[in-house]
Every structure is written in structure tokens, then in C-alpha cells.
């Protein structure tokens, strides 16, 4: 049994880091493998993560962690029984993938303006809370070419757009994701999408 692709890990900068790797053949990750991880500080002990399968030869492990600080460094040991398959380390603050925003809502009752709001996925005492910016993706269910991205570079988790910038009388979907420039994070996953019917009063044309 060998590791084909070494574990790579990302942290949500809150309580979970996710590590993924590939073995050289089909593996029952949860029965055959264990990932031990230990914070490199005095009195810390190793914790065990039981991996799950992620495709035939792929494994994924969700590591429980404390609130992350930039000084945190973990040793990682991947074991198959008594055999050490791989040894490495991981600094959560250097590999951050934010949590996905939630509760995306489209408010259509504001005179010909669409107001999209969502929730910041972090509590106020988390460092990322005040450092997230967002991308909102809006697309038409009827027309695959009608696909747009709005970058929200301010901190408020909301976006206002004129309803008239979208076609009237058809259904749209929206989703949102986040990233934090300060830690050069990757983008979060997209939030679940929400659907609405776009309708607005066409301006009266005078001839």
C-alpha cells in the first residue's frame, strides 16, 4: 500500500481542516488508514482522524482544530496499521479556504431593485469575519449565456442591482462565495443557490 498523491490540506480558519490524498489503488480508507495530527506546542498530543473514501483510491479526512492563529503548525502522520506511509506538516493559516456564505436571500419588493443578502459564515470574534469579500453569481435558467459575476469588495454581505439589468419575466438563480485577501485564501465553495422570478415594470416609452 502506497500513497500516490500526498495529502494536501485546507483550513476553514475556524474549527476544521480538510485533508485529501490518493492511494495507489482501491482503498477502504476508514478501515485501513489513520491520519494522526498534532499541534506543535508543549503539552499537545496527537489526535486521530478516521478518513472517508473520496472516489476509489481517494481519501478525505476532517481534522478538528481550535481557532487558528498564524503560529499554529501541525505534524501529520498517515498510518496503515503499524506502517507509516507518509509524514508531513501543515500550517493552517497558510492554506485557508473560507466557509461558504449562507442564507442567501433575494428581496424583490424594493422598487425595481433586487437586494441580495447573505450571512457571513464566521462569528464576529473570528479574524476572517471582517476580511471577507464576495463574488455573486447570477444566471438565467433559460439561457446558459446569461451568466454574470458581481464582485462585492466591501464588507457588507449584500448586493443591490437594478432589476432591469436582468431580463424580465424569466427565472434566475444566484449563489455567492467568499475569499479573504489578507490570507491569500482560495475561494470558498459556492453557497446553495436561490431562485426567483424576475419581473419589473418596463419604462413607458414616449414617441
Amino acid at each position: 500500500m502506497k500513497v500516490l498523491q500526498e495529502p494536501t490540506c485546507v483550513s476553514d480558519y475556524m474549527s476544521i481542516s480538510t485533508c485529501e490524498w490518493k492511494m495507489n489503488g482501491p482503498t477502504n480508507c476508514s478501515t485501513e488508514l489513520r491520519l494522526l495530527y498534532q499541534l506543535v506546542f508543549l503539552l499537545s498530543e496527537a489526535h486521530t482522524c478516521i478518513p472517508e473514501n473520496n472516489g476509489g483510491a481517494g481519501c478525505v479526512c476532517h481534522l478538528l482544530m481550535d481557532d487558528v492563529v498564524s503560529a499554529d503548525n501541525y505534524t501529520l502522520d498517515l498510518w496503515a496499521g503499524q506502517q507509516l506511509l507518509w509524514k508531513g506538516s501543515f500550517k493552517p493559516s497558510e492554506h485557508v479556504k473560507p466557509r461558504a456564505p449562507g442564507n442567501l436571500t433575494v428581496h424583490t419588493n424594493v422598487s425595481d431593485t433586487l437586494l441580495l443578502t447573505w450571512s457571513n459564515p464566521y462569528p464576529p470574534d473570528n479574524y476572517l469575519y471582517n476580511h471577507l469579500t464576495y463574488a455573486v453569481n447570477i444566471w438565467s435558467e433559460n439561457d446558459p449565456a446569461d451568466f454574470r459575476i458581481y464582485n462585492v469588495t466591501y464588507l457588507e454581505p449584500s448586493l443591490r442591482i437594478a432589476a432591469s439589468t436582468l431580463k424580465s419575466g424569466i427565472s434566475y438563480r444566484a449563489r455567492v462565495r467568499a475569499w479573504a485577501q489578507c490570507y491569500n485564501t482560495t475561494w470558498s465553495e459556492w453557497s446553495p443557490s436561490t431562485k426567483w422570478h424576475n419581473s419589473y415594470r418596463e419604462p413607458f416609452e414616449q414617441h
Epitope: 506546542f41 508543549l42 503539552l43 498530543e45 478538528l64 503560529a71 499554529d72
Partner: antibody
């Protein structure tokens, strides 16, 4: 909210024994090392002992090895300190504390041990 | 054992003024990546100690930002930018490099 509540202190004669307890709540007890720190009346803080999250590793300041024993019961979320061969100079408030990144992130309110005849 | 030495022993302060406490260790508490194995604690009168600063310069949750930690190697400093009446108590530094964990003797901060 993390809570640590010590108990078991009291008046004991020199040479006597006492068992202190610390009930923990608000966090996953088995994931953390925990320590005992004491403070004699009008004096500074003194680290006594620590135990790893699983209970497999214990640590003591030299002056307490052999007389004091730290233990934990993760099923009861409780930390213990057995004090034997007590002396007058062991009179102190004994605090339990949750360890993280080497230091003490949360403290109990303390329990007073008085050694006197 | 690592010996921790704090100064001054007592520090009378005026509210609104800055204050500074020094802590020296008998061996270096710094590691390669620029982090320092030193914590600061405050014990207010009649209370348990509380963590203020960890790893030399990281402010603990809920601690006002007027508290800051700095230093490296064997010399460390706790600064209070503007002292408030609620800051009175005894301040301790502690090394977290090795067991036994050792504290400084404490600095008593009191209002003038």
C-alpha cells in the same frame, strides 16, 4: 462557555492527604491537556502538574514528584490531584487550568487547601 | 529550569497614561519562525488569573486592544497604552518553552 470548577480543598493536618477534583464543561475535555497551578497566600503563581488529553502523559514540577499525583477521567470530564504527605508550605489556593498552545487559556475559581495542626 | 524575572515589582500608574512591564528569561524563548513561547496573565484582586497575551504578542479573545506584547529572545515587554482603573492587579509572565512551566514573580499595578 468553558467552565472549570475545583473542589475538595479544606483543612488537613501535616502528613495528611487530600484529593482535589476539577469538573470541566463547555469544551471537549479529552482533546486538551489540563494543569494544576497553585498560589500560596500573598505569593505568586506556581505550576504543579499537567496531564495530556488522553491521560497517558503526566508532567510534574520537581518539588511535587512522588507526593502529588495527577489523573483524569475523560468519561466524567474531571481532573484530579491527589495530595499526599502534606506540609504547611503546601497551603495554597489550587487552580485547574485548560492548556492550549502551551499556556493556560481558562482557569477555575480555585480551591483552598490549608495544612495546619 | 528556566528562570523568569519581572520588573518592576510594583508599578503605580495614572489612569490614561501608558504602562510597561519587563520580563526576562534565563534562556531564549524564541523559535525559528518568529514566535515566542511566552504568555502574560493578569490576576485582578480576589479573582483567578486570566490570559492576556500568548506566544509573545497574540492578544487573547476578549482582551482590550490597549494591551500588547512584544520582545524576543530573553527580553519581553507588556504594554498598556492607556491604563484604566480596571487594569489593577498582579501581572505575571510565564514561559511555555519547556516543563516545568515557570512564572515570573509578578508585577503589582496600582492606581496612584
Amino acid at each position: 462557555e468553558v467552565q472549570l470548577v475545583e473542589s475538595g480543598g479544606g483543612l488537613v493536618q501535616p502528613g495528611g492527604s487530600l484529593r482535589l477534583s476539577c469538573a470541566a464543561s463547555g469544551f471537549t475535555f479529552s482533546r486538551y491537556a489540563v494543569s494544576w497551578v497553585r498560589q500560596a497566600p500573598g505569593k505568586g503563581l506556581e505550576w504543579v502538574s499537567a496531564i495530556g488529553g488522553s491521560g497517558g502523559k503526566t508532567y510534574y514540577a520537581d518539588s511535587f514528584k512522588g507526593r502529588f499525583t495527577i489523573s483524569r477521567d475523560n468519561s466524567k470530564n474531571t481532573l484530579y490531584l491527589q495530595l499526599n504527605s502534606l506540609r504547611a508550605e503546601d497551603t495554597a489556593v489550587y487552580y485547574c487550568a485548560r492548556n492550549l498552545r502551551g499556556g493556560f487559556w481558562d482557569w477555575g475559581q480555585g480551591t483552598l487547601v490549608t495544612v495546619s495542626s | 529550569d528556566i528562570v523568569m524575572t519581572q520588573s518592576p515589582l510594583s508599578l503605580p500608574v495614572t489612569p490614561g497614561e501608558p504602562a510597561s512591564i519587563s520580563c526576562k528569561s534565563s534562556q531564549s524563548l524564541s523559535e525559528g519562525q518568529g514566535y515566542h513561547r511566552l504568555d502574560w496573565y493578569l490576576q485582578k484582586p480576589g479573582q483567578s488569573p486570566q490570559l492576556l497575551i500568548y506566544l509573545g504578542s497574540f492578544t487573547a479573545k476578549g482582551v482590550p486592544d490597549r494591551f500588547s506584547g512584544s520582545g524576543s529572545g530573553t527580553d519581553f515587554t507588556l504594554k498598556i497604552s492607556r491604563v484604566e482603573a480596571e487594569d489593577v492587579g498582579i501581572y505575571y509572565c510565564m514561559q511555555t518553552l519547556q516543563t516545568p512551566l515557570t512564572f515570573g514573580g509578578g508585577t503589582k499595578v496600582e492606581i496612584k
